[in-house]
């Protein structure tokens, strides 16, 4: 039930996340499932546990197997399993199916290819990108943060894309590659009146004075690429930028996700060092598109 497949190539770094949810303060114990032997946390080991992460620096074929993680939360211990397979490097260019991450689809308007699993690693830009083993060159290709953007996508752009980056651990560098297929589709979408998934209308969010708090505004707008769609936060009916409180900021850029095929956007409002006066404000999550505007209001209440 709580098992996750992970794979990598020998002599590359592989980092695996425990498939159970955790919190920063909860310890996570890792074990070799077959032997029940504990995995060390000391970084001098080639394979070591680091909280929710299990690190193979670098990986070897013999590391393949099932690993157990136990999140030591109060009340219940949450147990998960990581099924790890390390493969020998291929001599030819073909990437076998078992090394492929999920296929992504793009269109003329939306052609982002995310580098799989990169968020688990300590890497620095730029990423290197390859298509069918050839390094991508030309102004149509732009490596931006953790994804590749292709301008003026054509059907010939379909294929297998590999991202390559360097993971740094305590001054040592390890190579990582990840490959996924990209398909090009005709965009046949539709738009709906915005549906706000979070927060609930008139939700009361409990916060602690002096701590940081995050509010997420999440809404869906239809299927496919949306011509106009936005989510944003307002404070007492005023745009965040106009409100003039530097402690309260919206997350730069909107995080796009596809839920059940729907185009959805998230915007996180970050409140640093929550103060008493923040409890008096009205926080409005706004979602708008060509059909209109929907608003959900949140208020903050104090946690003792």
């Amino acid at each position: 039930k709580f098992s996750k497949q992970s794979w990598g190539l020998e002599n590359e770094a592989l980092i695996v996340r425990c498939p159970r949810q955790g919190k920063p303060s909860y310890t996570v114990d890792w074990y070799y499932s077959q032997t029940n032997k504990s995995i060390p946390t000391q970084e001098r080991n080639r394979v070591f546990a680091s909280g929710q992460l299990l690190k193979f620096l670098p990986a070897e074929v013999a590391d393949s197997g099932i690993y157990t993680c136990i999140v030591r939360s109060p009340t219940f211990n949450r147990t998960g399993y990581a099924n790890v397979t390390i493969y020998k490097k291929q001599s030819d260019c073909n990437v076998p199916d078992y090394l492929m991450y999920s296929t992504v689809s793009g269109s003329e308007k939306n052609s982002k290819i995310y580098c799989p699993t990169i968020d688990l690693y300590n890497w620095t830009a730029p990423l290197e990108w390859f298509k069918n083993c050839q390094a991508l060159q030309g102004s149509r290709y732009r490596a931006h943060k953790s994804f590749l953007v292709i301008d003026n996508v054509m059907t010939e752009d379909a294929g297998d894309y590999t991202c390559k980056f360097i993971h740094n651990e305590n001054g040592a560098n390890y190579s990582v590659t990840a490959t996924r297929s990209f398909t090009v589709k005709d965009e046949q979408g539709f738009s709906l009146f915005p549906v706000i998934g979070a927060p609930a209308q008139n939700e009361i969010k409990e916060v602690e004075i002096g701590k940081n708090a995050n509010l997420t505004c999440s809404a869906c707008f239809g299927k496919g690429t949306q011509f106009l769609a936005a989510v944003l936060w307002q404070l007492n009916g005023t745009k965040i930028t106009d409100f003039g409180e530097p402690r309260i900021q919206q997350e730069e850029g909107q995080n796009q996700s596809f839920s059940n095929g729907l185009a959805c956007l998230d915007m996180v409002l970050r409140i640093a060092d929550v103060k008493e006066e923040d409890l008096l404000l009205q926080y409005d999550c706004l979602a708008l598109n060509l059909h209109g505007l929907r608003r959900h209001t949140v208020r903050l209440s104090r946690k003792n």
Partner: antibody
Framework: EVQLVESGGGLVQPGGSLRLSCAAS????????MHWVRQATGKGLEWVSS???????YYSGSVKGRFTISRENARNSLYLQMNSLRAGDTAVYYC?????????????????WGQGTTVTVSS | NIVMTQTPLSLSVTPGQPASISCKSS???????????LFWYLQKPGQPPQLLIY???NRFSGVPDRFSGSGSGTDFTLKISRVEAEDVGVYYC????????FGPGTKVEIK
């Protein structure tokens, strides 16, 4: 307003079944572990069952194999399917909210309780 | 299973006077995250339990400051500095280090 409302209680014969429901409102249901606690008349509180945010389930020894807890996040609802009921299961059943997994800072125990629904097992 | 015991099981208090309830656990309630998972609840007649104290000594939102919690490891105490008529009911301690266990309850009444 944060609220939990239980329903589905009633009179049932030994060996019979009941399904309790709990409707949650005023908070992001999907980020909380949820629990059932019962209380026989004039007695103390007894934990019955729990379901975490990822759907893992937990049961007290006295109900294991007979009761099934489940949740439907899209409907903000918690359920307790009770089979093979015994006289000893007669109690007020409370739905209660547990740990918030969207909050890294603190765990408030069982901080919100419903009013309870009464289950009577008798022939 | 962690067993919780409470003393006394009943308590009759004069309004304005202090009251104290003891709770003991069969093993330490200190978690590896450094927090102690001990809670106090009050159940007023005909009502569901309501949270008073979390994490041994933290008053929950809206709880009057005449209620205070203390203790560590396996020994805990709930104190009411000046008992009021509205404080009558049954007080339960609860652990959530391993599943949930409640103490047997302490019935507080007014003299």
């Amino acid at each position: 307003e944060v609220q939990l409302v239980e329903s589905g209680g009633g009179l049932v014969q030994p060996g019979g079944s009941l399904r309790l429901s709990c409707a949650a409102s005023g908070f992001t249901f999907s980020t909380f572990d949820m629990h059932w606690v019962r209380q026989a008349t004039g007695k103390g509180l007894e934990w019955v069952s729990s379901i975490d945010t990822e759907g893992d389930t937990y049961y007290s020894g006295s109900v294991k194999g007979r009761f099934t807890i489940s949740r439907e996040n899209a409907r903000n609802s918690l359920y307790l399917q009770m089979n093979s009921l015994r006289a000893g299961d007669t109690a007020v059943y409370y739905c209660t909210r547990g740990e918030d997994w969207s909050d890294d800072d603190y765990y408030y125990g069982l901080d919100v309780w419903g009013q309870g629904t009464t289950v009577t097992v008798s022939s | 299973n962690i067993v919780m015991t409470q003393t006394p099981l009943s308590l009759s208090v004069t309004p304005g006077q202090p009251a104290s309830i003891s709770c003991k656990s069969s093993q330490s309630l200190l978690h590896s995250d450094g927090k102690t998972y001990l809670f106090w609840y009050l159940q007023k007649p005909g009502q569901p339990p309501q949270l008073l104290i979390y994490g041994v000594s933290n008053r929950f939102s809206g709880v009057p400051d005449r209620f205070s919690g203390s203790g560590s490891g396996t020994d805990f105490t709930l104190k009411i500095s000046r008992v009021e008529a509205e404080d009558v009911g049954v007080y339960y301690c609860m652990q959530s280090l391993q599943l949930f266990t409640f103490g047997p309850g302490t019935k507080v009444e007014i003299k």
